[in-house]
Each structure stands twice: as structure tokens, then as C-alpha cells.
Interface confidence: low
């Protein structure tokens, strides 16, 4: 259906509150450096304009495309050239090039300081004084730090955030109530951001086909009772939703996501028995609930895969006459039977099956050639299983911090050219896989671990793409989405690396270290560990253990000293000298 005014259509569909929130998010993701007040003003003006168009669709400019309207609005920002440099050149372009230009300037690592919450009393006063402004600030702060955040999901988290304050600001001990709830929400938000960045990277770097394959596997695991037609329909719609959000079309994305939730709820009988509770909720909670819904039980009478994919004499005909449908069916049938496999593994198996058919269907006797194809999957399945087993054992032995350090050493040796902050950030996140997945039952471990690793390694790829320094990282990131993790796992020590010159400044510490929260203290120590390795890449695990132990003792000693700063300036150089001697 064609609408006279696209902006009026979206305003009517989404309602004023969600419309305004999404516009604020869109602007904050594009112009990440602008102050909150400027964005509030822009969002207010766009919302007022949309409201006017909803009342009179043939009003002036109401027929313009959303990209034109939003782009024109962004280009009115006075400080564009000062704050964003060459991003201002985007305004010289016409649509759709102008929007593509804005998208290309999104910064995945804007370097804003971490959000520090003020005192609970001040927070509650701000919340009670102007709830709308308070939640707008939350949307703004998250959106500018995470320019690819899944916008409709951010509206949901803002609603959760509101709920936390509504509850905790009434509590006797506000701090005790707010602390754990805000932290739990923070963890969810960070994971959500990373997951959506992975989806956007899949679409942008590897195309619709890669994203659709990923989604077919995931949804077939979750909804094994749904038939392939139903899975295909949901995947097609879901692809459109994520393409829109990744492309900055947040109003269309949120609207289409709501439509998809509506469709799933209207057709739950042919999708999953687990959707009922979700479908009774309002739109934001409904979509979120559907995205997180538990797996349905497998149908009891699933026949062997071999009948259709190995034993059937028509396999090559089926494959050659409609390759994507046939491979999609294979992926669907395999995934619904294997909820315990990671999506990445399922996609590798489908790729292996495809390669086998490409080879075998060109021979004189295809059935003999592909007869053992399912047996040939074994090494592909064993590899992540063994990896998870080995790493979970290491995690259980070392704990999260120790496991992070082991990964830090491993990854610094693989790619020592990568910047220290990136190596620390990524290794710390990789280390969290232990806490997140190793306590799960055997049947859920691989899926949890490998799919989480894919999301974290995507962060490494995104950061590295901004300033590429390692050919091997570029290779692992760009050759194959499903083989990224095995590619990184397979990297050995980079023998071509020339050690970094020693810089005493890097290993100089001050008394402010003592007052840092535990996590930030760990980051400081881990930064030193990476720098040490870049200086002495041949250091053994034993040597590093000794030096890190000494370093921990040094920090403890100086933080307990009467004259902390004096202790750091006196003992620090001694520690560095001892470390250098130990690592010869």
C-alpha cells in the first residue's frame, strides 16, 4: 500500500512516544558527538512535523522520503563541520548517497567515558522531576555509544530502566535496590549491542544470504515443529527488519518488527507451542519475549536425514534445480534435529554438504561419491566440542580473571600488532564466555560458547577494520563468516612480529590505581600484561605468571602504604627492572 506521507504513516503506526524515541535514537547514532539538548530539539521538531503531516497528509514536505527529511534535519546542525569534519561533506550529496555517507561515518569506538551513575538520590530526583527527559537521556547515551544498537530493543530497555527507577526510588535503601538491577540491565544492553552489531556485519559484509542462513539455522532450532515454509517466511521478514535497522531506517524497522510479532502471534499454532505467554503482552515486551522465547520440543517422529539427503536417487537433481531451496531445507532439517549445536557449526555442516554435492554431482556415480557425506561431518562437530571442553576446564581451574589473562596472552601472541586497548577489551569479553557458558549443561555448552565467541570476535573485526594493522586478522575477519572462530583458534604465534621498543612510561603506575573499582584495576594490570608481551613476545607462560604475580604484590603493597604515591614511584622502577631481567 502506497502512502501519501511516509512520515505520517510511521507516526500513526508507532504512536507519538515510540516515534519520538526512535527519532532521538536515530539522530544520536548518526551525530554521536552532539550534546543531548541538541538532539532533543531535533527530535521534538521532527515529531511535531510528523504530527502535522498525520493531521494533513498533503501538507508541505509531507510527501518527502524519511531519508530526505532526516538528512535535511541533520544538515541543519551548525557545528557539523567543527565536530565531525568530513562528515559535513555528506550534506553536499543527494539521497540515497547522503544517507550512505552518514552511515559510513558511524563510529563503533567513539571513545566516550563509561557511564558513571550519580548518587541514587540525585538520580531519583531527576527521574521524578522529568521522567521523559530522564529516559531520553538514557536512549541518547546508549545510542551514541552503540551506533548500531537495535532501536526497538533499546526502547524496550528504556522501559525496563524506567521500571527499575519507579520501583527503587520508592525503596528505603535506594542504592541497594538500584545497584544490582542497573548492573544486570547494563550486562543485557552490552550483549544486545554486540549481537546486533554481529547481525549488521553479517548483512553488510556477507550479504542477505549469509544472514538468512544464520536465521534459518537459529529459528529451526528454536521452532522445530514449524515447517520450512513457516521458517522461510519468518526469516524473510526478520531479514527485512534487521536490514532496515542496520541501514538507519529505524522507524520502518520498528514498524516491521511489530508486524512480524503480530504475524507470529496470529500463526503460533504453526510456529511454536511456546509463544502464548509472549503474545498477551504489549508490543515492545511481545517482540522482546518472542526474540528470547525458549525452544519448543522436537516433534517425536522425525525421520532420518539420510532418506532425503543421501539415499534419495534424486539428490543431485534436487540440488541442481534449486540449490538455495535444497540447501535451506537441509539446514532446516539438520538444525531442528540438533538444538545442541552452535549455529556456526550448523552452517559449516551445510557448507560441507554443499561442497560435497558440488564435487559429487559432477562425477559419473554421484550416489557412491556422497554416500558417506554425513559421516564426514564428524571432525567438524568434534572440533568445537573439544575446544569448549578444553577451555571450560581451563576456566574452572583459573577463574574468570585468570582465564581472561590466558586468552590475553594467546591473542596477543596471535596478533601483537593489534592495539592494546582492543586486545584487552576483546580478551576480557572472550573470557566471559566461561562465566556465561561453562556452568550450563553439556547439551547447551557448545551452542552458548561458540555463538557468543562469534559475536565477540565480530567486535575485534569491527575495531580492526577501522585501523587495519594485521593481515592475519583481516584474513580471518573477511574470508568466511562461519569460519571466523576456527580461523582465529587456528592462528599460531606471529613469528614475523618485531618486538616493541621498551617504554618506561607504559609501566609507570600511580596511587590513583588504588581507588579504582576492581574491574578497572584488572584492566590496568591486563594492559601491562599485553605491553609486556609486545615487548617480549617470546616470554613463556611461567615467566609471565611470575611477573604478573610480582605486579599484583607490588600494587597491593603500595596501596596499603602510608605514602602511596611515594611507594609507586620508588618500587615501580624496581619491579620493571626485575621483570625485564626475568624475561631475558
Amino acid at each position: 500500500e502506497a502512502y501519501k506521507s511516509e512520515i505520517a504513516h510511521r507516526y500513526n503506526d508507532l504512536g507519538e512516544e515510540h516515534f519520538r524515541g526512535l527519532v532521538l535514537v536515530a539522530f544520536s547514532q548518526y551525530l554521536q558527538q552532539c550534546p543531548f539538548e541538541d538532539h532533543v530539539k531535533l527530535a521534538k521538531e521532527v515529531t511535531e512535523f510528523a504530527k502535522a503531516c498525520a493531521a494533513e497528509e498533503s501538507g508541505a514536505n509531507c510527501d518527502k522520503s524519511l531519508h530526505t527529511l532526516f538528512g535535511d534535519k541533520l544538515c541543519t546542525v551548525a557545528s557539523l563541520r567543527d565536530k565531525y569534519g568530513d562528515m559535513a561533506d555528506c550534506c553536499e550529496k543527494q539521497e540515497p548517497d547522503r544517507n550512505e555517507c552518514f552511515l559510513a561515518h558511524k563510529d563503533d569506538n567513539p571513545g566516550f567515558p563509561p557511564l558513571v551513575a550519580p548518587e541514587p538520590d540525585a538520580l531519583c530526583a531527576a527521574f521524578q522531576d522529568n521522567e521523559q527527559l530522564f529516559l531520553g537521556k538514557y536512549l541518547y547515551e546508549i545510542a551514541r555509544r552503540h551506533p548500531y544498537f537495535y532501536a526497538p530493543e533499546l526502547l524496550y530497555y528504556a522501559q525496563q530502566y524506567k521500571g527499575v527507577f519507579a520501583e527503587c526510588c520508592q525503596a528505603a535503601d535506594k542504592a541497594a535496590c538500584l545497584g544490582p538491577k542497573i548492573e544486570a540491565l547494563r550486562e543485557k544492553v552490552l550483549l544486545s549491542s554486540a549481537k546486533e552489531r554481529f547481525k549488521c556485519a553479517s548483512l553488510q559484509k556477507f550479504g542477505d544470504r549469509a544472514f538468512k542462513a544464520w536465521s534459518v539455522a537459529r529459528l529451526s532450532q528454536r521452532f522445530p515443529k514449524a515447517d520450512f515454509a513457516e521458517i522461510s517466511k519468518v526469516v524473510t521478514d526478520l531479514t527485512k527488519v534487521h536490514k532496515e535497522c542496520c541501514h538507519g531506517d529505524l522507524l520502518e524497522c520498528a514498524d516491521d518488527r511489530a508486524d512480524l510479532a503480530k504475524y507470529m502471534c496470529e500463526n503460533q499454532d504453526s510456529i511454536s507451542t511456546k509463544l502464548k505467554e509472549c503474545c498477551d503482552k504489549p508490543v515492545l515486551e511481545k517482540s522482546q519475549c518472542l526474540a528470547e522465547v525458549e525452544r519448543d520440543e522436537l516433534p517425536g517422529d522425525l525421520p532420518s536425514l539420510a532418506a532425503d539427503f543421501v539415499e534419495d536417487k534424486e539428490v543431485c537433481k534436487n540440488y541442481q534445480e534449486a540449490k538455495d531451496v535444497f540447501l535451506g531445507t537441509f539446514l532446516y532439517e539438520y538444525a531442528r534435529r540438533h538444538p545442541e549445536y552452535s549455529v556456526s557449526l550448523l552452517l559449516r555442516l551445510a557448507k560441507e554438504y554443499e561442497a560435497t554435492l558440488e564435487k559429487c554431482c559432477a562425477t559419473d556415480d554421484p550416489p557412491t561419491c556422497y554416500a558417506k557425506v554425513l559421516d564426514e561431518f564428524k571432525p567438524l562437530v568434534d572440533e568445537p566440542q573439544n575446544l569448549v571442553k578444553t577451555n571450560c576446564e581451563l576456566f574452572e581451574k583459573l577463574g574468570e580473571y585468570g582465564f581472561q589473562n590466558a586468552l590475553l596472552v594467546r591473542y596477543t601472541k596471535k596478533a601483537p600488532q593489534v592495539s592494546t586497548p582492543t586486545l584487552v577489551e576483546v580478551s576480557r569479553k572472550l573470557g566471559k564466555v566461561g562465566t556465561k557458558c561453562c556452568k550450563k549443561p553439556e547439551s547447551e555448552r557448545m551452542s552458548c560458547a561458540e555463538d557468543f565467541l562469534s559475536v565477540v570476535l565480530n567486535r575485534l573485526c569491527v575495531l580492526h577494520e577501522k585501523t587495519p594493522v594485521s593481515e592475519r586478522v583481516t584474513k580471518c575477519c573477511s574470508e568466511s563468516l562461519v569460519n571466523r572462530r576456527p580461523c582465529f583458534s587456528g592462528l599460531e604465534v606471529d613469528e614475523t612480529y618485531v618486538p616493541k621498543e621498551f617504554n618506561a612510561e607504559t609501566f609507570t603506575f600511580h596511587a590513583d590505581l588504588c581507588t579504582l573499582p576492581e574491574a578497572e584495576k584488572q584492566v590496568k594490570k591486563q594492559t601491562a600484561l599485553v605491553e609486556l608481551l609486545k615487548h617480549k613476545p617470546k616470554a613463556t607462560d611461567e615467566q609471565l605468571k611470575t611477573v604478573m604475580g610480582d605486579f599484583g604484590a607490588f600494587v597491593e603493597k603500595c596501596c596499603a602504604a602510608e605514602n602511596k604515591e611515594g611507594c609507586f614511584s620508588e618500587e615501580g622502577p624496581k619491579l620493571v627492572a626485575a621483570a625485564q631481567a626475568a624475561l631475558v
Epitope: D227, F228, A229, E230, S232, P303, A307, D308, D312, E314, K317, N318, E321, A322, V325, F326, T329
Partner: nanobody, 126 residues
Framework: EVQLLESGGGLVQPGGSLRLSCAAS????????VAWFRQAPGKEREFVAG????????YYADSVKGRFTISRDNSKNTLYLQMNSLRPEDTAVYYC???????????????????WGQGTLVTVSS
């Protein structure tokens, strides 16, 4: 749920023709892999012809290739089997079977089809 209802069977002389129909309800037939099977007295049920779900790719048993044609009319939600040059050995009860899903595979394994019609009798005799 898919309900299937066959019609068009009857008595025909060798060399003659018949057209079987299978009306589907409860699901669009173009999104369903559908097939015709037959069962002669005292014999196993056997695959005759099939057509994929979401793709018009057809399959035939060697014994009927060149004589039988499977097709569907999406607007009428109906599957057809045009049978020409009929032989006495084609005598059997013909069943329509459905396997929902946009899959081009029309398996020849009867057990893989969850939905079946009640059958229509075809007798080829002089």
C-alpha cells in the same frame, strides 16, 4: 492441518486416459510438497509422482515416466494427475499425500508424508 480429498477414479480400458484431482484445504498447496502414491491389492504402497513445495519441480516413478503428468492449480488449491496410455498394471487405489513446507523434495518414502487422502480406485481392464 491439511485435508485432502481425491476424485476422478473409475474404470477405463487399456490405452485410455483418466485425470485424478486432489482438493486441499487448511493450507495453500503451493507451499506444500505433494505426491501421488498407489497401492495395488496385496502390494506395498508405491510412489507415482510428486511436485515440490514452493518450486514446480516434478518427479516420477520410472514405471510412469512419459505417460503420467503431475500438476497443480494454485488458484483452486488442487493437485492433478493426468494418466495417459493406461495399462492393466496401473490398477490400484491412488492416494494423494502432502508434506507441508516450501521444500522441493518430494520424497518417495510414504512414511515422510503426514497427510493423506482416503484414496480413489482406478481400474484398467478391457
Amino acid at each position: 492441518e491439511v485435508q485432502l480429498l481425491e476424485s476422478g477414479g473409475g474404470l477405463v480400458q487399456p490405452g485410455g486416459s483418466l485425470r485424478l484431482s486432489c482438493a486441499a484445504s487448511g493450507r495453500y498447496i503451493d507451499e506444500t510438497a505433494v505426491a501421488w502414491f498407489r497401492q495395488a491389492p496385496g502390494k506395498e504402497r508405491e510412489f507415482v509422482a510428486g511436485i515440490g513445495g514452493g518450486v514446480d519441480i516434478t518427479y516420477y516413478a520410472d514405471s510412469v515416466k512419459g505417460r503420467f503428468t503431475i500438476s497443480r492449480d494454485n488458484s483452486k488449491n488442487t493437485l492433478y494427475l493426468q494418466m495417459n496410455s493406461l495399462r492393466p498394471e496401473d490398477t490400484a487405489v491412488y492416494y494423494c499425500a502432502a508434506r507441508p513446507g516450501r521444500q522441493l523434495i518430494t520424497s518417495k518414502v510414504a512414511d515422510l508424508y503426514p497427510y493423506w487422502g482416503q484414496g480413489t480406485l482406478v481400474t484398467v481392464s478391457s
